[in-house]
Interface confidence: low
């Protein structure tokens, strides 16, 4: 909140301050303006403006200081590049509009590295990745010229540096400054100039924020070897010690706003719920401030690590609660943290260096008061003892990820205050917070925490098997009757859980084809465990063809797999993976997780198809309470069973049943998915409640899925909880920690 | 302790190839990019070029552009140096080396050498 | 590419004595910025792969005697044996770092007189 902010309110007229093309609307009761063009247009000369101590709007002056009348909405243009090194640019042109394009071309010698077309977008900015031309003559690899920047250093060996400069008028974003690193790699984060209208979209901050806090929750060591021209995949540990904090700080002041507030704590529970879903339990540190900081959470409190209570703390906040000292200290505010991260009596407690520090700060970015909230970064590094030994600099000790919120951010500011490390971002500018609401859940790469089950890299550059890498293909060749296709679900480092009537007695392993992660190569068997009570002309005497009573069959793989972000386990019902997984109480019971997973009413579930070669999810409702009973007794429709005359003679305990149209109406599942796994989707993760068996109408005749299908078409699974001793013996030593 | 440990000397005939292993252990093959570099009988040491094991990316003196090839097995934490096109100039010991860093230029480690003999 | 001479080619000493082998580079190895120069000193012994000595021009690898050393800066390089002992025959080679492709000058065969 500048000074000049806090007038009176309404002390400026609004006569003539009209944008051309556009419209203007106030803010902070009415002691700021922010002019709003149409898309593909931008506020000429400025964005906003401030109501002065003299009664009169802020001049419209342009960047190079000249006033201008009324302001216009213009059309948005992409920066042209300054400099390409080691190659051409084509077209030439001293502006590009949204939607031009240019290519990049080398020279003799040089490869490209980056984007080759590059397209102007929307927001002013062009899509892709700086395109640069290296012949790998450097220690460190060429860096580039980001589009609009200047670069002044050609030189790439060990400590070399590199300076970057924008035009005048834009901010620059990211590191002035690099030096070439032993290992090939720059310091700092590649620069950008921005303009006062730019804004990261919504998607751009999900990918860039959700790289950079990568985690590897099983504790791999943060110094990973890698050459020139390779970006380090640097990985912050959570581990279950809880060696992590994490400091949310959250600007409650004018300027920032009563929506953007409720915004940004909403898209703060949101993290805090993802964080929890990995079984990890980082401690949290909660600030508020205005001109004052106010904690709500201390790192040291005991609760600071139960993630629900954390949760209730921030959703209890509220943005008046600083509403009569409204300024903004965020010097004051960080001062907060560092008191939560230093010790008493400076005596430096056991494992303080292992303690990995996030701090997560929602602002504008327009402190008023208190100084330079930098100072107290740069004390921060101190204490943590960050870049003071070049051989071990600690830098991943701390990050300070900052989003700067609404139209009067102050980029050098923001930028001042976020870390900069090498192909990271850590600094966002954000028109609107609610709309970073949907995609904020996904700003954690749960890339690296392989072993846990149920986990999914929910991101828009995912494949197929990133959604669903428990998902396994399975085919059964039988020389001269063809072939039959499955599905299971990987459960482990060596079994694969699918449906028992996928194989018959005379299948070879060597005929049995399993290929998991998308992956064209096939997996090697070793054996296929049935359940011993499987039989599937038990009962052809009583006059049933088929009975799929225990329908369950383990596949041993010969190697172990390799988890990856496209093969990993599902949870398995009452096991210690799920019991984290749905952060319950390690003291819970396998009849507790039962009824969490499976209580007596209609239970929202999903199963997994492939279609036209895409694995596509199918949400479908377990029937489990009042229309259980009727959705059995559908049964009595399937070909084969209309003589029977008690239906529990096929629809034994072990089925549960989807399908039908009430409460929606189900998809159904294809031949193919047999042996697919059932799975509810709780708290962000996924857990396997059946195996697909067999169904009453066969909806996918000609390999296409019907749309009209009857209300008795339902879908039998054999539900796993009654198959649990089974599985326990079976995988006991897999790890599995059954209950 | 780290050891790089190479394959056994070889006789080719001009035109041939010959292919070179370095077998690593000690430390995380991965984590360190490997140098291949050459000495002809009574000659000065020769940079040929180095691999990274972690991505399998090359980089080739320009000399030996086209002729040779570095591959790795990261199964076996192994490198591998092939030179094709052998002329009688290419006898020498071929020795594998690492760094201290990921890309470090000093060359702390090196293997035993390989003597190859080209000749008719 | 950087041509790298040593001088001389050959060098016999008395042990106990002073060895002082030269190395010139066709081009200033010094980067001004950081004072560094891209130079390192290396020890073969018949049979043997070489040895680091000295990188950085100056610097010694730990675990080597401090009879050795190395001067010099931009084009003209010295490595230094202050007093030889039996164990330092060998070829000593000078490699440059500063450009692609790295490389070594001819070598110096050093004997006891």
């Known amino acids: 909140t500048p000074w000049s902010l806090a007038r009176p309110q309404g002390s400026c007229s609004l006569e003539g301050v009209e944008i051309k093309g556009g419209s203007f609307r106030l803010l902070q009761e009415g002691q700021a303006l922010e002019y709003v063009c149409p898309s593909g247009f931008y506020p000429y000369p400025v964005q906003t403006r401030t109501c002065r101590s003299t009664g009169s709007w802020s001049t419209l002056k342009t960047q190079d200081q000249k006033t201008v009348r009324k302001a216009e909405c213009r059309a948005i243009h992409c920066p042209r590049p300054h400099d390409f090194e080691n190659g051409e640019y084509w077209p030439r042109s001293p502006y590009y509009n949204v939607s031009d394009e240019i290519s990049f071309h080398c020279y003799d010698g040089y490869t490209l590295r980056g984007s080759a077309n590059r397209t102007c977008q929307v927001n002013g900015r062009w899509s892709g990745q700086t395109a640069i031309c290296d012949n790998g003559a450097g220690y460190c690899s060429n860096p580039g010229i980001p589009i609009g920047t200047r670069k002044v250093g050609s030189q790439y060996r060990l400590e070399d540096s590199v300076t970057y400069h924008c035009s005048r008028g834009l901010t620059l974003r990211g590191s002035q400054r690099r030096t070439c690193q032993e290992g090939g790699s720059w310091s700092g984060t590649e620069p950008s100039c921005q303009d006062s209208f730019m804004y990261d979209t919504p998607q751009e901050v999900a990918e860039a924020f959700l790289s950079s806090l990568t985690e590897t929750i099983e504790g791999v060591d943060a110094e990973d070897g890698h050459g020139p021209g390779e970006q380090q995949k640097r990985k912050i540990v959570l581990d279950p010690s809880g060696s992590m904090n994490i400091y949310l700080v959250l600007d409650g002041s004018d300027s920032i706003g009563a929506s953007n507030f409720t915004g940004a704590k909403k898209c703060l529970v949101n993290l805090i719920e993802k964080v929890a879903s990995y079984g990890v339990k980082p401690r949290y540190g909660l600030v508020t401030y205005a001109t004052y900081p106010k904690i709500w959470v201390k790192v040291s409190e005991a609760d600071s690590s139960n993630a629900d209570w954390v949760t209730k703390q921030l959703n209890e906040i509220n943005y008046e609660d600083h509403k009569l000292k409204s300024g903004t200290n965020t010097k004051k505010a960080l001062q907060a943290v560092y008191s939560m991260m230093s010790w008493p009596d400076d005596v430096p407690p056991e494992g303080w260096n292992r303690t990995r520090h996030v701090i997560i700060l929602m602002t504008d970015g327009l402190h008023n008061m208190g100084g330079d909230p930098i100072t107290v970064i740069d004390e921060i590094r101190d204490l943590l003892y960050i870049g003071k030994d070049r051989k071990n600099p600690r830098e991943d000790y701390l990050d300070v990820y900052v989003f700067g919120v609404g139209p009067l951010v102050n980029q050098v500011n923001i930028n001042a205050l976020a870390s900069k490390k090498d192909n990271e971002q850590h600094v966002f500018k954000v028109k609107d917070m609610e709309n970073l609401e949907d995609v904020f859940y996904q700003m954690i790469d749960e890339s690296q925490s392989l072993s846990l089950c149920g986990m999914v890299w929910e991101h828009r550059k995912g494949t197929d098997y990133h959604k669903q890498p428990w998902q396994a293909k399975i085919s059964v060749i039988r020389p001269s009757k063809g072939h039959e296709s499955c599905m299971g679900a990987v459960v482990s480092e060596y079994f694969v859980l699918t449906a028992a009537h996928c194989f018959t007695v005379d299948d070879k392993e060597h005929s049995i084809k399993v290929s998991v992660g998308g992956e064209k190569r096939d997996l090697e068997i070793e054996v296929v465990l049935f359940h011993p009570n499987y039989n599937i002309n038990g009962k052809k005497e009583a006059g049933i063809p088929e009975f799929y009573d225990y329908d369950v069959a383990l596949i041993k793989l010969k190697n172990k797999l390799k988890y990856g972000q496209t093969i990993r386990p599902i949870c398995l019902p009452c096991t210690e993976g799920t019991t984290r997984a749905l952060r319950l109480p390690p003291t819970t019971t396998c009849q507790q997780q039962k009824e969490e997973l499976l209580p007596a009413q209609d239970i929202k579930a999903l199963f997994v198809s492939e279609e036209e070669k895409k694995l596509t999810r199918k949400e479908v409702y377990i029937k489990n309470g009042d229309k259980k009973g009727s959705c059995e007794r559908d049964a009595q429709y399937a070909p084969g069973y209309d003589k029977v005359k008690d239906i529990s003679e096929v629809v034994t305990p072990r089925f549960l049943c989807t399908g039908g149209v009430s409460p929606y109406a189900d998809p159904n599942t294809c031949r193919g998915d047999s042996g697919g796994p059932l799975i509810v989707h709780k708290r962000s993760r996924f857990i396997q409640v059946g195996v697909i068996s067999w169904g009453v109408v066969d909806v996918c005749k000609n390999q296409k899925r019907q749309k009209q299908v009857p209300a008795h078409a339902r879908d039998f699974h054999i539900n796993l909880f009654q198959v649990l001793p089974w599985l326990k013996e079976k995988l006991q030593d897999e790890d599995l920690g059954f209950l | 302790e780290v050891q790089l440990v190479q394959s056994g000397a070889e006789v080719k005939k001009p035109g041939a190839s010959v292919k070179v292993s370095c077998k690593a252990s000690g430390y995380s093959f991965t984590d360190y990019y490997m140098t291949w570099v050459r000495q002809a009988p009574g000659q000065g040491l020769e940079w040929m070029g180095w691999?990274?094991?972690?991505?399998?990316?090359?980089k080739y003196a320009q000399k030996f552009q086209g002729r040779v090839t570095m591959t790795r097995d990261t199964s076996i934490s192994t490198a591998y140096m092939e030179l094709s096109r052998l002329r009688s100039d290419d006898t020498a010991v071929y020795y594998c080396a690492r760094g201290y860093y990921a890309n470090s230029a000093w060359f702390a480690y090196w293997g035993q050498g390989t003597l190859v003999t080209v000749s008719s | 590419d950087i041509v790298m001479t040593q001088s001389p080619d050959s060098l016999a000493v008395s042990l106990g004595e002073r060895a002082t082998i030269n190395c010139k580079s066709s081009?200033?190895?010094?980067?001004?910025?950081?004072?560094?120069?891209?130079l390192a000193w290396y020890q073969q012994k018949p049979g043997q792969p070489p040895k680091l000595l000295i990188y950085?021009?100056?610097t010694r690898e730990s675990g080597v005697p401090d009879r050795f050393s190395g001067s010099g800066s931009g084009t003209d390089f010295t490595l230094t044996i202050s007093s030889l002992q039996a164990e330092d025959v060998a070829v000593y080679y000078c490699?440059?770092?500063?450009?692609?492709?790295?490389?070594f000058g001819q070598g110096t065969k050093l004997e006891i007189k």
């Open positions: 691999i990274n094991p972690n991505s399998g990316g090359t």
């Open positions: 490699k440059q770092v500063y450009n692609l492709p790295w490389t």
């Open positions: 950085w021009a100056s």
């Open positions: 081009q200033s190895l010094l980067n001004s910025r950081t004072s560094k120069n891209y």
